[in-house]
């Protein structure tokens, strides 16, 4: 439906740095009208680092996570904080720097091959928007030897875009975050205009793919002041009219 398209907002407009979630995007979002009834955000708190406002981890850089800056601080005020290095305390995966994950409250290396039995209780600790992909793990013990680093396929639960297979990003859908396809040329996207409001989104779109940016769809049949959809378009410096 038109409503669901217009309310399917992009997470960000630029591709993420290699191997991780995107950096600081500008964002503007709208909740789907009339049907959902969010009961409020309750976030825990952690130490201060830098004052970039955020609502979820995906809005922060690959070496950051989103949380309230002080213990017991205002849950509504969150900023991007520096990730925790190996052996530092953590409450969830997103707090740990890339290459690490949160196990028993401590950031540990995820470089070695971790098996299902070793991480059964440490896949993720909730703290804001936190869902680690378990794609490739069966919860049946007979299939427990699949590797932790198996990339999530479409529809798999994820924590960040680097959890997802190539061509996919980690985006919110209903009350989870799942791997969805990165947008292709011509697909509808949302140009974000406001920072720190991703918590309102329930249907996030991925960012536009490499070489594309989210721009107003050129439609000469519409008046210039009418609202127009944004689509993923090839990068152009300027639109010059060349005479051949």
């Amino acid at each position: 439906t038109l409503n669901s398209v217009l309310n399917s907002n992009a997470i960000k407009n630029l591709p993420p740095p290699l191997g991780g979630a995107a950096g600081h995007p500008g964002s503007a979002v709208s909740a789907a009208p009339g049907i959902l009834y969010p009961g409020g955000n309750k976030y825990q708190t952690i130490d201060n680092y830098q004052p970039y406002p955020c609502a979820e981890d995906e809005e922060c850089g690959t070496d950051e996570y989103c949380a309230s800056p002080t213990r017991g601080g205002d849950a509504g005020v969150q900023i991007c904080l520096a990730c925790r290095k190996r052996r530092k305390r953590c409450m969830r995966h997103a707090m740990c720097c890339p290459g690490n994950y949160c196990k028993n409250g401590i950031c540990v290396s995820s470089d070695q091959n971790h098996f299902r039995g070793e991480i059964e209780e440490t896949i993720t600790e909730s703290f804001g928007n936190d869902h680690s992909t378990l794609d490739g793990y069966s919860r049946r013990t007979t299939l427990s030897s699949k590797m932790y680093h198996t990339k999530g396929q479409e529809g798999s639960v994820c924590l960040r875009s680097s959890d997802c297979a190539s061509g996919l990003c980690c985006a919110r859908h209903f009350w989870s975050k799942i791997c969805k396809p990165v947008l292709k040329e011509g697909q509808v996207c949302t140009k974000h205009r406001r920072k720190g409001s991703h918590g309102l989104e329930i249907f996030q779109r991925c960012y536009c793919g490499e070489g594309l940016s989210c721009r107003i769809q050129k439609d000469h049949h519409q008046a210039s002041n009418s609202s127009r959809l944004h689509t993923c378009q090839r990068h152009h410096h300027h639109h010059h009219h060349h005479h051949h």
Partner: antibody
């Protein structure tokens, strides 16, 4: 092994209240979305409420304002506070979670709620 | 909300036969390049069990005889060769829009 065990069902009069619980084990409970889905006798399935890993709550129109979903991550427990119960709320109530994909991929065995005078 | 209509209401087949169940949505359940259609199996007195998600992806531990197909508004669950334990009620469910909705179910019974 992932386990979800519901409790708290029973017989209640119209207008009454009931609190359902769901005890979870076998996964890091706090990280995942978890929901209540119900099934009236001899009928199909109906989504009732959900709570995300980031503690947002969601309801359909049919129960909004009457039911409240909540979770206690320290106790690995999910709750459904049901007020102003109606005969049409009579059903088996299941807790279900989304661990590997966006669908309801793990379910409890359900607890029966009967609203009758 | 999106209404899902399943057909037939009842399917009478013998073990070893192929079962084809249909689910039609009142509007497309495709978005983000994914078909948000899921299938569940429910046996009497038991909780539902996820068989298929995203129209064609198998849930954990689901036998290969269960497969899903379709996109947009029309979806099919196929059981290639019915086993005795497959006789149950099957529900489709969409996750494209809130509220997530279920179909009325198809009962697969022994002929």
């Amino acid at each position: 092994e992932v386990q979800l065990v519901e409790s708290g069902g029973g017989l209640v009069q119209p207008g009454g209240s009931l609190r359902l619980s769901c005890a979870a084990s076998g996964f890091t409970f706090s990280s995942y979305a978890i929901s209540w889905v119900r099934q009236a006798p001899g009928k199909g399935l109906e989504w009732v409420a959900s709570v995300s890993g980031w503690m947002d709550t969601y309801y359909p129109d049919s129960v909004k304002g009457r039911f409240t979903i909540s979770r206690d991550n320290a106790k690995n427990s999910l709750y459904l506070q049901m007020n102003s119960l109606r005969a049409e709320d009579t059903a088996v109530y299941y807790c279900a979670t989304s661990l590997e994909n966006y669908a309801f991929d793990y379910w409890g065995q359900g607890t029966t709620v009967t609203v009758s005078s | 909300e999106i209404v899902l209509t399943q057909s037939p209401a009842t399917l009478s087949l013998s073990p070893g036969e192929r079962a084809t169940l249909s689910c039609r949505a009142s509007e497309s359940v495709d978005d983000f390049g994914i078909s948000f259609m899921n299938w569940y199996q429910q046996k009497p007195g038991q909780a539902p069990r996820l068989l298929i998600y995203a129209a064609s992806k198998q849930g954990s531990g689901i036998p290969a005889r269960f497969s899903g197909s379709g996109s947009g508004t029309d979806f099919t669950l196929t059981i290639s060769s019915l086993e005795p334990e497959d006789f149950a009620v099957y529900y489709c469910q969409q996750s494209k829009e809130v509220p997530p909705t279920f179909g009325g179910g198809t009962k697969v019974e022994i002929k």
